[in-house]
């Protein structure tokens, strides 16, 4: 039978660490992390790490009992937790019968937004006390709310992650940029900044209707290639809503004209 893994939480040092071992298995060959979305209940889910590792293909895996994975997160609150994955069988060959290295994966460790994680893994039995313990570590920074997986988190949807403003911005002339975007049903107030190294233009927008809106913004210097930053102020996130960006291009001859005054905003900073 092929070995599989059974994983469970292990806080503190592994019991094998207290025992002297004449021989120990080698280190891992590779360690990788990706995100997975797992359903918890209807319309509820959590984002977890899918941690996969590859064993070194040599006879030392005959001694391998388990692999221990620890994750520490550095954000507002530091976190640290470990799981121990026991191999259900002794390894009878250094590679899978079908070819390729022995590869295993564990899905767990809930992921917070925009957090730096250090994931480290080592084989058990590991090196004896006062000896170098071979372990493999990878850094992983979890993405923010605009990530295709993260954007469905409640924290993100409340900050406007599912809103697609579809920003277009074009330079009408040396002094004017036209910005078009789709408003958000959760709010009616926006700020628009046009920036290069400094702020070239600024506008505040109030718009109650759910619609495509257009704003003409005066600029102080060359605006082509500048970044347009659109910040919504929604009921659910107040001043902490997700900012969206676009780039100023030259207006084409066929670009839509600025709509009549009732839909047009030209509020200089």
């Amino acid at each position: 039978r092929e070995p599989t893994i059974q994983c469970g939480s292990e806080t503190g040092p592994s019991p094998e660490w207290m025992v002297q071992h004449t021989l120990t298995p080698g280190d891992l060959r590779d360690l990788q992390v990706e995100l997975v979305k797992t359903s918890v209940a209807a319309e509820e889910f959590s984002i977890l790490m899918n941690i996969s590792w590859i064993l070194r293909a040599d006879a030392s895996i005959r001694l391998l009992k388990a692999t221990k994975i620890c994750v520490s997160g550095k954000n507002n609150m530091n976190s640290y937790s470990c799981v121990r994955c026991n191999y259900t069988e002794a390894f009878q060959s250094q590679t899978r019968p079908s070819g390729g290295k022995w590869t295993f994966s564990y899905v767990g460790f809930p992921v917070e937004l925009s957090t730096l994680y250090l994931i480290s893994a080592h084989n058990i039995p590991n090196a004896n006390m006062n000896e170098d313990s071979p372990s493999l570590s990878v850094n992983f920074t979890s993405p923010g709310c605009l990530n295709h997986v993260m954007k469905y988190k409640k924290q993100c949807t409340e900050a406007g992650s599912l809103w697609d403003p579809d920003i277009t911005a074009c330079k009408k002339n040396e002094k004017m940029v036209e910005v078009n975007f789709t408003t958000n049903p959760l709010g009616n107030r926006y700020t628009i900044l046009i920036q290069r190294d400094t702020t070239l233009g600024f506008s505040r927008v109030l718009e109650n209707k759910l619609m495509r809106t257009s704003v003409a913004i005066p600029v102080t210097e060359e605006s082509e290639g500048a970044v347009v930053q659109l910040t919504p102020y929604l009921h659910t996130c107040g001043n902490d809503c997700i900012r969206r960006e676009g780039t100023v291009v030259l207006c084409s001859e066929t670009s839509a004209p600025i709509p009549p005054d009732d839909n047009r905003r030209m509020l200089g900073g």
Epitope: T22, L23, G26, A57, D58, A59, S60, R62, L63, Q92, S93, Q94, T95, R96, P97, S98, G99, G100, K101
Partner: antibody, heavy 118, light 107 residues
Framework: QVQLQQPGAELVRPGASVKLSCKTS????????MNWVKQGGPEQGLEWIG?????????QYNQKFKDKAILTVDKSSSAAYMQLISLTSEDSAVYYC???????????WGQGTLVTVS | DIQMTQSPASLSVSVGETVTITCRAS??????LAWYQQKKGKSPQLLVY???NLADGVPSRFSGSGSGTQYSLKINSLQSEDFGSYYC?????????FGGGTNLEIK
Amino acid sequence: QVQLQQPGAELVRPGASVKLSCKTSGYTFISYWMNWVKQGGPEQGLEWIGRIDPYDSEIQYNQKFKDKAILTVDKSSSAAYMQLISLTSEDSAVYYCARSGGFDWFAYWGQGTLVTVS
Amino acid sequence: DIQMTQSPASLSVSVGETVTITCRASENINSNLAWYQQKKGKSPQLLVYDVTNLADGVPSRFSGSGSGTQYSLKINSLQSEDFGSYYCQHFWRPPYTFGGGTNLEIK
């Protein structure tokens, strides 16, 4: 049955390179590492040069040969290759390909290629 | 690298006798040891792996033993086809190394 076929001999000039082949049959090529072994002459000992995993082409060399041998595989034809570079008279030897078993005991051997540098 | 020291380097014996070849590793190889037989002008052939397991087709007069750093190959009632060279090899972790060989010749 498992077979590893190697050409009998190669004659090469000093400073030149040679690429030795090891054509396999009778087993799933990607399931076992392929090793290369040098035997310096009659009654002389065996030296492990390195190994390659045909599945993903991972290679491990004996440090002594890392600037001398280049291991490759061609999965489509189930063949392993070893290129020997900057040849000198010291490289004159019989070179064997040998397939690993479950671990790295060498369960099957090719007939060997005699390389003569002259 | 792990050194494999094989002894004796050569042995002259008669058909029907029993011989033992020994192999010492410079460190514990956890029983990851193989033995090979090589006849003149031929490629080596696997005899024994994992210290005691006989390869397919190997006669039962061959047997292996040992652990840690000390290993041996015993051939009971030598036959004429058993003459040739014998090598031990560890496969604990790369780089793999062979013993210097034992040349078994007919007395």
